[in-house]
Interface confidence: low
């Protein structure tokens, strides 16, 4: 088969800060005279092949664009007809058209511009969950967890921040952990607690606010 062909989704959508895997298969002529290894690169549409670096490549000698370095990864091995692309920490300005290019020295150089990938990075619409184990009882320590189960394990780990205007049992107003350990007091009842999660790889922050319901054990004196 002397045809160059690429099979991949025409369009992929991912929310900013998250990850996406783009399955891709690539086919090229099997010319016996080409002795060099097959290398592949993903490039952004509109760039000059001689002046601009790819966003991801299998060629260890080739530089990649600074904006995508460490975030765009050519997972597949083009020598095995796999051009799968993995994107982590997606950013809004990643939105655009991308195409694959295969090189096999000295004869084969081909850009698959008829099968371009349209990448859409949309606003992060998900919010964290604040998990409270059981009830909050005044005078008893409790662990609150801020959870982002939809986040990508392969992405840059998010940072957590807790904020409250009137949480008397917090020594400081913020903590960098996803778990907040505190001992609520009766006067904390009804106050608001916010967990902010920042995905630094994409520069986006999401938050969840709850109202604390602090109960007293029977027998506890009211002030």
């Amino acid at each position: 088969d002397l045809e160059f062909q690429l099979v991949a989704p025409e369009s992929v959508t991912v929310e900013e800060g998250l990850c996406v895997h783009v399955p891709c298969s690539v086919f090229y002529p099997s010319i016996k005279l080409t002795l060099g290894p097959v290398t592949g690169s993903w490039l952004r549409k509109g760039v000059s092949l001689h002046e601009d670096s790819p966003v991801a490549t299998s060629d260890p000698r080739q530089l990649v664009q600074k904006a995508t370095q460490g975030r765009f990864q050519l997972l597949g091995d083009p020598q095995k007809h796999d051009c799968s692309l993995f994107i982590r920490d997606a950013q809004k300005n990643d939105t655009g058209m991308y195409f694959f290019r295969v090189v096999r020295e000295p004869f084969v150089r081909y850009s698959y511009k008829k099968s371009q990938l349209s990448l859409h990075v949309t606003s992060l619409s998900r919010t964290p969950d604040i998990i409270i184990p059981g009830t909050l009882e005044a005078g008893y320590p409790s662990n609150l967890t801020c959870s982002v189960p939809w986040a990508c394990e392969q992405g840059t780990p998010p940072t957590f921040s807790w904020m409250s205007t009137a949480l008397t049992s917090l020594s400081s107003r913020t903590t960098d952990s996803s778990v907040l350990t505190f001992t609520p007091q009766p006067q904390d009842h009804g106050t608001k607690l916010t967990c902010l999660v920042t995905f630094s790889g994409a520069g986006v922050t999401v938050e969840r606010t709850i109202q604390l319901n602090v109960t007293r054990k029977s027998g506890q004196m009211r002030e």
Epitope: V12, L18, D77, K80, C152, Q154
Partner: nanobody, 120 residues
Framework: EVQLVESGGGLVQPGGSLRLSCAAS???????AAWYRQAPGKQRELVAS???????NYADRVAGRFTISRDNAKNSVYLQMNSLRAEDTAVYYC???????????????WGQGTMVTVSS
């Protein structure tokens, strides 16, 4: 260990509907998900796929009849099959992609398959 549980297959008359489900257990994070099918004596073929962000792709022969969806919180993917035809008879497999690579090769998880028979 990641395990996939598929359900929803069965016998249905032409023109009928079925809903297939595939749930992943074992704590894996699913980025892309897809349904494949394999009819007797034929190669396995892609039916539909869906990305984490919700973009979908369908094989031409099922477009407009089948709908793929997912519940990210439940790590589950579904295939709603309407207006079923005899040629849809096959074993349907779900494939989940955790976005991981082993020795620079993408790693996929496959279900055990569920039989769909369309016959009058």
């Amino acid at each position: 260990e990641v395990q996939l549980v598929e359900s929803g297959g069965g016998l249905v008359q032409p023109g009928g509907s079925l809903r297939l489900s595939c749930a992943a257990s074992g704590g894996t994070f699913v980025i892309n998900a897809a349904w494949y099918r394999q009819a007797p004596g034929k190669q396995r073929e892609l039916v539909a796929s869906i990305s984490y962000g919700g973009s979908t792709n369908y094989a031409d022969r099922v477009a407009g009849r089948f709908t793929i969806s997912r519940d990210n919180a439940k790590n589950s993917v579904y295939l709603q099959m309407n207006s079923l035809r005899a040629e849809d008879t096959a074993v349907y497999y779900c494939r989940l992609d955790p976005g991981l690579a082993l020795n620079n090769r993408p790693l996929y998880y496959w279900g055990q398959g569920t039989m769909v028979t369309v016959s009058s």
